[in-house]
Interface confidence: low
């Protein structure tokens, strides 16, 4: 027989299958030209002095063989006697060490069995109730395919799946969406209608997240305020990568979680933009302001759940950095300017009332002043801390007041509003005896005690009504009580106490009046 | 429900003055930002000048700063944009715009994100 040709012979070897695991398998056949074949076949175990003969039987019964050696593949034209527009039946017996091994047989017609490629290119998947939808566009001239998948977890081997018929320009497949697991995806065709004909190889991998991205388990620290009055927000923990199966692990695109980061600044809600979103990578500088933060998780079917945590103010106070003065036309504000061009947003709340709204307001930008203070002002009758009661401050600059990362905190102190001279008279003076020339002076905190770094010192005057003579007693701004002595029996005293600030001396208290009794001796 | 409307818009020369008015209605709040805004051809529309609505505080652009002078008269609802030395420059559609108060009992905010806004009016300066 010649080579080329299907020799109608009985083969060269003694034919009884060995019933052997290995050997032949996965024969496909095609046509690869209007007048070419081709079949090729897989062959397990050891190779070495093994010879290979495709069979094939005609519908009438002949039966022929190729000998191709050690080769596992064989190309023939619809010349060499093997009938190409009818139904065959092909095998691969390969004979080794004086036994035979059989392939499992296809049955087909050789014309109609044309080599069909898998899905090509780009593979969309979308999320469809539930279910995974992948589309993908028929590779040219093979409309009409059947369409099979198969899918593994990280945990799991492959399992097979039906796509059903497809016969368009695009093809199609619900695929079973699992909730928390990545998922890789092949597919592979073959003509529809041709049970015998052969499966096109797999698909590169199409790999898919879980439905729901992984919460993300992080943990942030806050810097301390730096004296740029910024800190630095950084990350403590990163995000736990998602377990891959064995074809996504790699650059496989698909299975991407991508983390970001929305910052909220919550204080001075007057300003333009209050929010801002950054990828998790860029840990940005923020404010002495309160923010919440949430870490965003989002795959390729959008946004998973978030996390959220509050990160509170810094408390840490400036005692002097501000001063306020209070006129008849209204109250101005100074500090310490920025830069040229700078935003100011000052806020301010009643200590004790931090739940509620802070009074927020925005400067146009403003460059420093001669003595490189930068300035806010007011009229009386807006009312603005007006009342006599302590206010927290804080006042934040940027010069890009629309860039959220961009604020940064000025100062952050305390100021008794209202008539603060008057309201800070310390009441209930009381004078008791404590010697025989000394007595003990108590007095209740002042109201400015309550608003922490406004009470410089409370001052204690004490008036000898016979002379006239006036001491005064300085007093730490924690304590409510003096010891006057050197006191004489028998002489009335008046004693007074007023509260100071560190930029107004306090109204004296109602004078109380006293004396030490002549004591008489027996 | 909120109306603006404006007035005053002429073709004037360089160097001479309009008042342009902005007349509301609808609107109830104690608390608010008023403002004028203008449009060039071809440009963004850009803040000119913005008022408080409780102590009158005032915000001007730069290129406007020291020729133009914003007003108010609570009595007739209405918002005045004096405009002196007007410039080729100056030349576009002027709005008015308004926006509630943004949590602040005594703030102004000058900015393209106002929530009412009329319709325009033309001021050309040109020889």
């Known amino acids: 027989c010649r080579t080329s040709e299907c020799c109608f012979q009985d083969p060269p070897y003694s034919d009884a299958d060995s019933g052997s695991a290995s050997g032949p398998r996965d024969l496909s056949c095609y046509r690869i030209s209007s007048a070419g074949y081709e079949c090729s076949w897989q062959y397990e175990g050891p190779t070495a002095g093994v010879s290979h003969f495709l069979r094939c039987c005609l519908s009438s019964g002949r039966c022929c063989y190729f000998a191709t050696g050690s080769a596992t593949r064989l190309q023939f034209s619809d010349q060499a006697g093997v009938s190409v527009l009818h139904t065959v039946t092909l095998w691969v017996e390969s004979w080794a060490r004086n036994r035979t091994e059989k392939s499992p047989e296809v049955t087909l017609q050789l014309y109609k069995s044309v080599k069909y490629k898998p899905p090509l290119g780009d593979i969309k998947v979308s999320k469809l109730a539930g279910q995974l939808r992948m589309e993908w566009e028929t590779p040219d001239n093979q409309v009409g395919a059947e369409v099979q998948f198969r899918h593994r977890t990280p945990s799991s081997s492959w399992k097979l799946g039906d796509c059903g018929p497809q016969d368009d320009d695009t093809e199609s497949c619900l695929c079973p969406l699992e909730m928390n697991v990545a998922q890789e995806f092949q597919l592979r065709r073959r003509r529809l209608g041709s049970q015998g004909s052969s499966w096109s190889k797999w698909s590169s991998p199409v790999c898919v997240p879980p439905e729901n991205p992984p919460q993300p388990q992080v943990r942030f620290s806050v810097e301390q305020l730096g004296r740029d009055g910024r800190r630095r927000l950084t990350l403590k923990e990163q995000p736990t990568q998602l377990e891959l199966p064995e074809g996504c692990q790699g650059p496989a695109p698909g299975v991407e979680v991508t983390y970001q980061l929305q910052l909220h600044m919550l204080s001075c809600p007057c300003k333009a933009k209050a929010t801002r979103t950054l990828p998790l990578e860029k840990m940005p500088y923020l404010s002495g302001a309160a923010y919440n933060v949430a870490v965003i998780s989002s795959n390729r079917f959008g946004p998973g759940p978030n996390q959220t945590w509050h990160i509170p103010a810094d408390t840490h106070t400036e005692p002097v950095a501000l001063n306020i003065s209070v006129g008849t036309n209204g109250t101005t504000m100074y500090w310490p300017a920025r830069a040229q061009s700078t935003t100011y947003c000052i806020e301010w709340q009643p200590v004790g009332q931090e739940g509620s709204l802070a009074t927020c307001n925005l400067t146009a930008p403003q460059d420093p002043d001669p003595a490189g203070m930068a300035t806010y002002s007011w009229s009386r009758e807006s009312g603005a801390m007006g009342q006599e009661k302590c206010y927290h401050i804080t006042i934040f600059a940027s010069a890009h007041p629309k860039k959220l990362t961009l604020w940064s905190t000025v100062l952050s102190t305390y100021h008794f509003g209202g008539n603060a001279s008057a309201a800070g008279t310390p009441h209930h003076v009381s004078v008791k005896n404590h010697s025989l020339d000394s007595v003990s002076v108590d007095w209740a905190p002042s109201l400015l005690s309550t608003c922490p770094g406004v009470l410089k010192e409370y001052v204690v005057r004490c008036r000898d009504e016979d002379s006239n003579q006036v001491s005064e007693h300085p007093v730490q701004p924690t304590e409510t009580q003096v010891t006057l002595s050197d006191l004489r029996a028998g002489v009335a005293y008046t004693v007074q106490v007023r509260a100071d600030t560190a930029w107004l001396r306090g109204a004296w208290s109602q004078p109380q009046r006293f004396s030490i009794k002549v004591q008489v001796s027996d | 429900q909120v109306q603006l409307q404006e007035s005053g818009g002429a073709l004037v020369q360089p160097g001479g003055s309009l008042r342009l008015s902005c007349v509301v209605s609808?609107?109830?709040?104690?608390?608010?930002?008023i403002g004028w805004f203008r449009q060039a051809p071809g440009k963004e529309r850009e803040g000119v000048s913005c008022?408080?609505?409780?102590?009158?505080?005032?915000i001007y652009s730069d290129s406007v700063k020291g020729r133009f002078t914003i007003s108010r008269d609570n009595a007739k609802n209405t918002v005045y944009l004096q405009m002196n030395s007007l410039k080729p420059e100056d030349t576009g559609v002027y709005y008015c715009?308004?926006?509630?108060?943004?949590?602040?009992?005594?703030?102004?905010?000058?900015?393209?994100?106002?929530?009412?806004w009329g319709k325009g009016t033309p001021v050309t300066v040109s020889s």
């Open positions: 008022i408080g609505s409780s102590d009158g505080s005032t």
């Open positions: 609808g609107f109830t709040s104690d608390y608010f930002a």
């Open positions: 715009a308004l926006d509630r108060g943004r949590r602040t009992i005594i703030g102004y905010a000058c900015y393209a994100t106002m929530k009412y």
